[in-house]
Every structure is written in structure tokens, then in C-alpha cells.
């Protein structure tokens, strides 16, 4: 299972499509940023063996997508965008599953590291709390969109380190 | 935690088709595939298919290909299940399935079955 | 496609003996991917063990999953009353997605 290339490629997808999202200028939703704390030291790569990895990458697309599922989403998008970007989000989901299966010569491998798998949950929940807060008003939804974009580009840097390291 | 409740009883004659649904309600997501697994009297658990209700994507187990149809509205929340051309060995408890957003990792969530509804019974008869 | 076969069939066993059911794969399984499920009579199945060896909310420690590559094995420390049903193991395989039981084995009171 060629992970970094497959997924990279999908990852690059959905930055396209996610910048093609954007509605109103961020200039406008300045007085809306939000420091989220995206959990960077989970994807620094290195205490990361392949199947652990390949869990963490999981869980934040799986994240992503239920957020951007939600009916106050499919409110806020242009239809036919979230439509591929969640095509493309589920594409990559499935790709994950399949090198989980892949990987299954190395069995003994644990498939993650529980602190990270949260750290990942809780970024996310501090992103719907936030919409919550702000009661998913189109800047805060910009503001997400900005966020979510700038930690699928963290994490394909982690792909990237994970490509060298194979 | 996830409640599943699905359509009641049928009785159905051979050669026709019948269809089931199953509501989804409390921590619910578009974005986990809900399932459809039956169990015919006395007999073990059966997979039939699946729906992804976020993007209407189905995947069905190779014996019920062309005689099944899955769909889903988002909201609320329900799966279907359409099944054709019935046999007398149809005759089955239908169950509607889906995985647990709590499940960690998520890449096991969608493996498997954390909720279940109470089943729909389908008697097929002459 | 996989086919899962579980052993014994029915297992015959009096309240706080051990139990160890197997459930073979006719080709690798990712034990991340491996999952047991309890069915009592007139009930819908419940979660047991999820990859391969974690136990679900709320399921007693005397229930453990194990094993790797083909051979698989959910083990209950001592039977309580309530632990007597049936018993299934699942796969799950992908692309495409696909779900796979074992037969089941019957845990009975002797």
C-alpha cells in the first residue's frame, strides 16, 4: 500500500476543493479567527510507525467529513462542491481501510496511539463548539473552512516526512 | 448512542418485493454507512448491503446483486431496503446496522455493527 | 471472498467454567478487522469484542478476544448465567466493503 502517494494525491483534491469553497473573503471574518490548537505534535511523524499513522490520517478526514455532512453545513456550501469534497474525503477513507488490510503481515503492529486519536477528536470538537458558539454563521463557517484547510497542509507535510521515512 | 427503529412485520407473497425502513435517532451521522443484515429463522447473521447516506453510495453483498435496493434521506436520518423477486427463503429477520462514531479509532468504526435495531420480521407465504 | 467457520458448534458448559470459541479464516484477516457479537434469543446481536482483542462499553473483563492471520479466539473466564447465547464472529474486507459472519457457536447450560 503506497500510502503518502495515494493519499497525497486525494489530499491535494480536497485542498483544491476546499479553496474553490470559499464564499466571502477572509478580510471580512478577521474579527472571527480562532486559534483551535491543531494538535501538530501528533503529526510530527516520527514515534509514528506506518499502521499508527494510517489511523491518525483516519481519524482526521472521518472528522472532517462528519463536520461537513451536517445539515448547517449543506446550508452554507454550494452543493455540487461539498458533494466532490466529501466524494473525495470518502475516497480517502476508503483508501486508508484498504492499507490497514494491506498491512496485514505485520500484524503485531498496534493500529494507534489512543493520546493522539484524541487529540485529533477533541481539535474537532473544539471546531463544532466554536460553530456552535457562533451559531454557524457564515464567517464562523469561513473561518472552519481556513482552519480545516491549513491542517489538511500540516498533515500532508506529515505524509511527505512518512514517504522519506519508507 | 444511536436508537434504530425500523418498520414492522410483513407477510409478502412469492415473486413480489417488500420494503423496510429504519430511522436513525440520537448521535447520528450522514457520514456512516448504515447496513442491512438479515437472519432467516433458526439460521446465522447475513450481510446485504450498504449505504453511505452523505453521497447515496451503496456497496451490496455479491448474493443479493440485482434483486436489492438501499437508499437513505438524511433527514431525519432512515436507510431502506428494497428487496425483489421474493423466495420463501427470504422469509428472515431484517435488521438495520450501523457503526458507532465513538468507536476509537474511527478507521475500525465503519468494520462493524455497534447499534442494531429490534429487527423486521418478513414472512414469505402463499 | 472469506469465509469465516466457527468451533465448536454448540459448547455445553455449567456456570463458571471457561469458554473458548475459534473462528477460522479461509484466507488473512486483519485482526484489526475482526469482531464478536453475542445474540441472545428473540434479541438483536450485541457488540462484544472489537479488534480483534477491545471489549465495547459496558462488557464484563471476562470476555477477551486474540489471535492473528486466520485463527481467532474469544475467550469468557467464567461463564455467569447471563452470558449463555450465541455467539458470532465478523470480518470486514475493502474495496470494495464487505462483511463477512462465522456460522456462530452456541454457549448452552450443560
Known amino acids: 500500500c503506497d500510502l503518502p502517494q495515494t493519499h497525497s494525491l486525494g489530499n491535494r483534491r480536497a485542498l483544491i476543493l476546499l479553496a474553490q469553497m470559499g464564499r466571502i473573503s477572509p478580510f471580512s471574518c478577521l474579527k472571527d479567527r480562532h486559534d483551535f490548537g491543531f494538535p501538530q505534535e501528533e503529526f510530527d511523524g516520527n514515534q509514528f510507525q506506518k499502521a499508527q499513522a494510517i489511523s491518525v490520517l483516519h481519524e482526521m478526514i472521518q472528522q472532517t467529513f462528519n463536520l461537513f455532512s451536517t445539515k448547517d453545513s449543506s446550508a452554507t456550501w454550494e452543493q455540487s462542491l461539498l458533494e466532490k469534497f466529501s466524494t473525495e474525503l470518502n475516497q480517502q477513507l476508503n483508501d486508508l481501510e484498504a492499507c490497514v488490510i494491506q498491512e496485514v503481515g505485520v500484524e503485531e503492529t498496534p493500529l494507534m496511539n489512543v493520546d493522539s486519536i484524541l487529540a485529533v477528536k477533541k481539535y474537532f470538537q473544539r471546531i463544532t463548539l466554536y460553530l456552535t458558539e457562533k451559531k454557524y454563521s457564515p464567517c464562523a463557517w469561513e473561518v472552519v473552512r481556513a482552519e480545516i484547510m491549513r491542517s489538511f497542509s500540516l498533515s500532508k507535510i506529515f505524509q511527505e516526512r512518512l514517504r522519506r521515512k519508507e | 448512542e444511536v436508537q434504530l427503529l425500523e418498520s414492522g412485520a410483513e407477510v409478502k407473497r412469492p415473486g413480489s418485493s417488500v420494503r423496510v425502513s429504519c430511522r436513525a435517532s440520537?448521535?447520528?451521522?450522514?457520514?456512516?454507512?448504515i447496513s442491512w443484515v438479515r437472519q432467516a429463522p433458526g439460521q446465522g447473521l447475513e450481510w446485504m448491503g450498504r449505504?453511505?447516506?452523505?453521497?447515496?453510495?451503496?456497496n451490496y453483498a455479491q448474493n443479493f446483486r440485482g434483486r436489492i435496493t438501499i437508499t437513505a434521506d438524511k433527514s431525519p436520518l432512515t436507510a431502506y431496503l428494497e428487496l425483489s423477486s421474493l423466495r420463501f427463503e427470504d422469509t428472515a429477520v431484517y435488521y438495520c446496522?450501523?457503526?458507532?462514531?465513538?468507536?476509537?479509532?474511527?478507521?475500525?468504526?465503519?468494520?462493524?455493527?455497534?447499534?442494531w435495531g429490534q429487527g423486521s420480521l418478513v414472512t414469505v407465504s402463499s | 471472498e472469506i469465509v469465516l467457520t466457527q468451533s465448536p458448534g454448540t459448547l455445553s458448559l455449567s456456570p463458571g467454567e471457561g469458554a473458548t470459541l475459534s473462528c477460522r479464516a479461509s484466507?488473512?484477516?486483519?485482526?484489526?478487522?475482526l469482531t464478536w457479537y453475542q445474540q441472545k434469543p428473540g434479541q438483536s446481536p450485541r457488540l462484544l469484542i472489537y479488534?480483534?482483542?477491545s471489549r465495547a462499553t459496558g462488557v464484563p473483563d471476562r470476555f477477551s478476544g486474540g489471535g492473528s492471520g486466520t485463527d481467532f479466539t474469544l475467550t469468557i473466564s467464567r461463564l455467569e448465567p447471563e452470558d449463555f447465547a450465541v455467539f458470532y464472529c465478523?470480518?470486514?474486507?475493502?474495496?470494495?466493503?464487505?462483511?463477512?459472519f462465522g456460522q456462530g457457536t452456541k454457549v448452552e447450560i450443560k
Open positions: 446496522a450501523s457503526p458507532s462514531a465513538d468507536i476509537i479509532p474511527s478507521i475500525l468504526g465503519t468494520t462493524l455493527f455497534a447499534f
Open positions: 440520537g448521535d447520528t451521522f450522514s457520514s456512516y454507512p
Open positions: 449505504i453511505l447516506p452523505a453521497l447515496g453510495v451503496t
Open positions: 484466507q488473512n484477516v486483519s485482526r484489526h478487522y
Open positions: 479488534g480483534g482483542s
Open positions: 465478523q470480518s470486514y474486507h475493502s474495496p470494495p466493503p464487505v462483511y463477512t
